[in-house]
Interface confidence: medium
């Protein structure tokens, strides 16, 4: 497994990581630690593991957190009620 | 090729349960979520849920929550929507349409063929 | 939940001819410069087809007479030569936030 660095799918990250886009080249895509509390993310990125290709910067919300909305268009990973 | 069968029609009282399966064949059944979506004679399309088919997590619309379970048998690779407390307004052909698995897009790129519910007394 | 609007609910055009379809969403579907639009068509007696996802990517198959434009809340299918097995139903559907919601659809006929 590639544990930082470029990757194509979940499969290739460690634990506690998955396949995102890049911040800085959106064609490259790059191990990324799931949400921690407090983190931004984007409330449809949940699926864990994804077997197909991420089209966001951000990771599902570690186990025990959720992705919700604190602001019209500001989500961040906050633990389930 | 890709194919989702789904159960035949049904036609059943208000206030009783329905169970809808779709059998997924042509692929990896657990790389792929499952939607299920309806739609009224001669209207348009209602999105009513999908599921992981590799750990069963699902996500409901919250017009349907309580009143929907959407299940999958990996050892059969079929998808089950069971909709309960049915009324008139439930009457719908009702589809089975697999998750393109385009990141998060949320696609459906294969559907099945519909299964007729009818609701009435 | 996200209102999606067509417009308009029914359109008839000659063979050959050009079929613009728009949407609008009562909200962005946006985010991170990625739209999060599909576009669908049912023809009579059959499941819908998946023709467009995010916005502007064709599907794997379909015509490339088929396009999809726009971002934000605005939206727009277009049939650059309308043939007469595009007759149909089609949907715009967002899937930026649950539920995801279907447009009324616009029926394409021919004139």
């Known amino acids: 497994a590639v544990i930082t660095g470029a990757c194509d799918k979940d499969s290739q990250c460690g634990g506690g990581m998955c396949c995102a886009v890049s911040i800085w080249v959106k064609s490259i895509r790059i191990c990324t630690p799931m949400g921690k509390l407090g983190d931004s993310c984007h409330p449809l990125t949940r699926k864990v593991p994804f077997f197909g290709r991420r089209m966001h910067h951000t990771c599902p919300c570690l186990p025990g957190l959720a992705c919700l909305r604190t602001s019209f268009n500001r989500f961040i990973c906050l633990a389930q009620k | 090729e890709v194919q989702l069968v789904q159960s035949g029609a049904e036609v059943k009282k208000p206030g009783a349960s329905v169970k809808v399966s779709c059998k997924a064949s042509?692929?990896?059944?657990?790389?792929?979520?499952m939607h299920w979506v309806r739609q009224a004679p001669g209207q348009g399309l209602e999105w009513i849920g999908y599921i992981s088919c590799y750990n069963g997590a699902t996500t409901y619309n919250q017009k349907f929550k309580g009143r929907v379970t959407i299940t999958v048998d990996k050892s059969t690779s079929t998808a089950y929507l069971e909709l309960s407390s049915l009324r008139s307004e439930d009457t719908a052909v009702y589809y089975c349409?697999?998750?393109?698995?385009?990141?998060?897009?949320?696609?459906?790129?294969?559907w099945g063929q519909g299964t007729l519910v009818t609701v009435s007394s | 939940d996200i209102v999606m609007t067509q417009s308009p609910d029914s359109l008839a055009v000659s063979l050959g001819e050009r079929a613009t379809i728009n949407c609008k969403a009562s909200?962005?579907?946006?985010?991170?410069?990625?739209?999060?639009m599909n576009w669908y068509q049912q023809k009579p007696g059959q499941p819908p087809k998946l023709l467009i996802y995010a916005a502007s990517n064709l599907e794997s198959g379909v015509p490339d007479r088929f396009s999809g434009s726009g971002s934000g809340t605005d939206f727009t299918l277009t049939i650059s030569s309308l043939q007469a097995e595009d007759v149909a139903v089609y949907y715009c559907q967002q899937i930026n936030e649950d539920p995801f919601t279907f447009g009324q659809g616009t029926k394409v006929e021919i004139k």
């Open positions: 349409a697999r998750d393109s698995n385009y990141g998060e897009a949320y696609a459906m790129d294969y």
């Open positions: 909200q962005s579907v946006d985010y991170d410069g990625d739209s999060y």
């Open positions: 042509g692929y990896s059944f657990t790389d792929y979520d």
